[in-house]
Amino acid sequence: ESSNQASLSCDRNGICKGSSGSLNSIPSGLTEAVKSLDLSNNRITYISNSDLQRCVNLQALVLTSNGINTIEEDSFSSLGSLEHLDLSYNYLSNLSSSWFKPLSSLTFLNLLGNPYKTLGETSLFSHLTKLQILRVGNMDTFTKIQRKDFAGLTFLEELEIDASDLQSYEPKSLKSIQNVSHLILHMKQHILLLEIFVDVTSSVECLELRDTDLDTFHFSELSTGETNSLIKKFTFRNVKITDESLFQVMKLLNQISGLLELEFDDCTLNGVGNFRASDNDRVIDPGKVETLTIRRLHIPRFYLFYDLSTLYSLTERVKRITVENSKVFLVPCLLSQHLKSLEYLDLSENLMVEEYLKNSACEDAWPSLQTLILRQNHLASLEKTGETLLTLKNLTNIDISKNSFHSMPETCQWPEKMKYLNLSSTRIHSVTGCIPKTLEILDVSNNNLNLFSLNLPQLKELYISRNKLMTLPDASLLPMLLVLKISRNAITTFSKEQLDSFHTLKTLEAGGNNFICSCEFLSFTQEQQALAKVLIDWPANYLCDSPSHVRGQQVQDVRLSVSECHRT
């Protein structure tokens, strides 16, 4: 017992931590003072009626990844205040409704990764009227969803079901829940997907399908009996798909009249871009989809891709597209021209070079585009990049951070409406007239700049942290500046006069510099009460670098002796 006690530490607020130890039972002597108890990653196998009897004020109990195989019937009987219960990844093969009956305050319940075959003989959750987040199922033994499983649940913020090996689904099992904001469904096979889809289409707002092999998925007409779908967002995560099955998936999505957002994360497309519809298939209508997000798409036969033209017509209404980290090196001109409503395009972490970008940003491409993100691609010339984007008449925001530009020419051409430019982490060592005068926000942080002397009459925000500047920029060159973030440079001091010269400045972040704590600097910073309102990272990040005897101390705390301040 005593070694068990030693593994647990509690603070004055009743937060007790005893995770990743060698506990083989719940420590004895727990009282009403305990508010939160984390005993995850131990070797607890058994929970008895008396273990938690006195914990009447317990709000969170985390028992994930132990070896729990038995919980006595009344183990949780005094936990009426419990809001968060995590029993995931244990050895509970039979779930009992008596455990949960007393938990009238429960908002979060995680039962994932326990080896039960079903969710028990009776409705487990019918008394949990405040439940918001529920996670159930496992990868291998959970094979059956029954009609009574979710009875009594009317509204859930999030429902996660690991039905990886599901073999039986009783119709209407999920229909009993009137509203689920986010349903996460793990299914290896697609065999029961349509049956489940029918039941959730009118109650789920965001549907997420995980780990499913859709290579052989075929859509057959649904007998929904109703078409009022609530689904606004559909996410496919770690899903396998082919050219043909993608077309079938699109037919499924066609059933969701109010679908606004489509997301594919970590998916594999085993295809070559042959999306031609067979003659008997009617044309797919993309409906109201406004946002398409693709992240880390893996296409094993990428270089065999040959024709995307059948998809072009589906894209005309889309407003926001993200295709991130998917080895994109070219967006066909024709596709760009079809994206007539596109306002936001994020191609971060891809392989774009200026010369191929020119093909993508051809005449009449992306006519409505306002924001273009090309962060961490293969761009190398600011001059070429700006020139390439001149065709985009409505472009106002450009993020080309994390490309290696190194140098900046004296002049560049940019779209005339540009307001925001992100050049952070681009290895530039100077800024020139290449930066457009129309900018309102400029980010040049994390570069090799030792000087900033550009006149930007409309600039409101300047982000220039992590450079090598030794002084604040000249305020007269930035007459409209509201925000200046200049932390982690080589600034040694700044004065009241310098700060006052920024007439419009509301926010200054200048911490993490090597301040020389002179008497003047100290008296200015310590006496100005209003300074704390402007310096958003004051006082924590303002440390003295010299004199040596105060190095590392916060500027606001340093006091120099009279003799140090009155030397002649």
């Epitope: 065999l304 090196f329 596709l335 392989l351 010369e355 093909n359 994390k402």
Partner: antibody
Framework: QVQLVQSGSELKKPGASVKLSCKAS????????INWVRQAPGQGLEWIGW????????NFNENFKDRATITVDTSASTAYMELSSLRSEDTAVYFC???????????WGQGTTVTVSS | DIVLTQSPASLALSLGERATLSCRAS??????????MQWYQQKPGQPPKLLIF???NVESGVPDRFSGSGSGTDFTLKISRVEEEDVGMYFC?????????FGGGTKVEIK
């Protein structure tokens, strides 16, 4: 500046394996692909395969698929190519090259000479 | 595999003369309006050096006497006025389909 520095010459017996290294500097290693290309004495260039350090994905010329392995150590910004079951026809200079824009090789290592002889 | 055939096999030119090197692919290397064809120069004992990518884009730092053209299956590398330092082998390379392939090369010499 961008540099790819390859390991030194190797003399191997038929049937043996060789592991070549290619250390990158002057650019963000995980943002670009690394290709391996070989050139037999007095011959043309032959593409072996590539790796993308960011996700470790590889692609090989079918002629090398069973014998070549390409790996990376991102913490050391180094790519490796191992070729097994060496035969005399594998005698060549092996180059690593940076893959830019998904399609072209803009920086090359100095090459490593591998000689396979009994 | 896409086979790239380069001609001529060798080319002997006088200084200042114009050089035209040809590369023919066994099938099209077009990819949505961009030809995925590169040209490299290789001098003895050195690695290849990129000259042209995407059929016609001159790599940064390459003298402007080099130019590339062509589409589909037929591509040309031109050197407007050959200089002493242009001596070496010239290879074309396609990246339209895997495996990526190189041409057999054209040797450029000065007469």
């Amino acid at each position: 500046q961008v540099q790819l520095v390859q390991s030194g010459s190797e003399l191997k017996k038929p049937g043996a394996s060789v592991k070549l290294s290619c250390k990158a500097s002057g650019f963000t290693f995980t943002t670009y692909g690394i290709n391996w290309v070989r050139q037999a004495p007095g011959q043309g260039l032959e593409w072996i395969g590539w790796i993308y350090p960011r996700d470790g994905s590889t692609n090989f010329n079918e002629n090398f698929k069973d014998r070549a392995t390409i790996t990376v150590d991102t913490s050391a910004s180094t790519a490796y190519m191992e070729l097994s079951s060496l035969r005399s026809e594998d005698t060549a200079v092996y180059f690593c090259a940076r893959l830019t824009g998904g399609t072209f090789l803009d920086y090359w290592g100095q090459g490593t000479t591998v000689t396979v002889s009994s | 595999d896409i086979v790239l055939t380069q001609s001529p096999a060798s080319l002997a030119l006088s200084l200042g003369e114009r050089a035209t090197l040809s590369c023919r692919a066994s099938e099209s290397v077009e990819y949505y309006g961009t030809s995925l064809m590169q040209w490299y120069q290789q001098k003895p004992g050195q690695p290849p050096k990129l000259l042209i990518f995407g059929a016609s884009n001159v790599e940064s730092g390459v003298p402007d006497r080099f130019s590339g053209s062509g589409s589909g299956t037929d591509f040309t590398l031109k050197i407007s006025r050959v200089e002493e330092e242009d001596v070496g082998m010239y290879f074309c390379q396609q990246s339209r389909k895997l495996p990526w392939t190189f041409g057999g090369g054209t040797k450029v010499e000065i007469k």
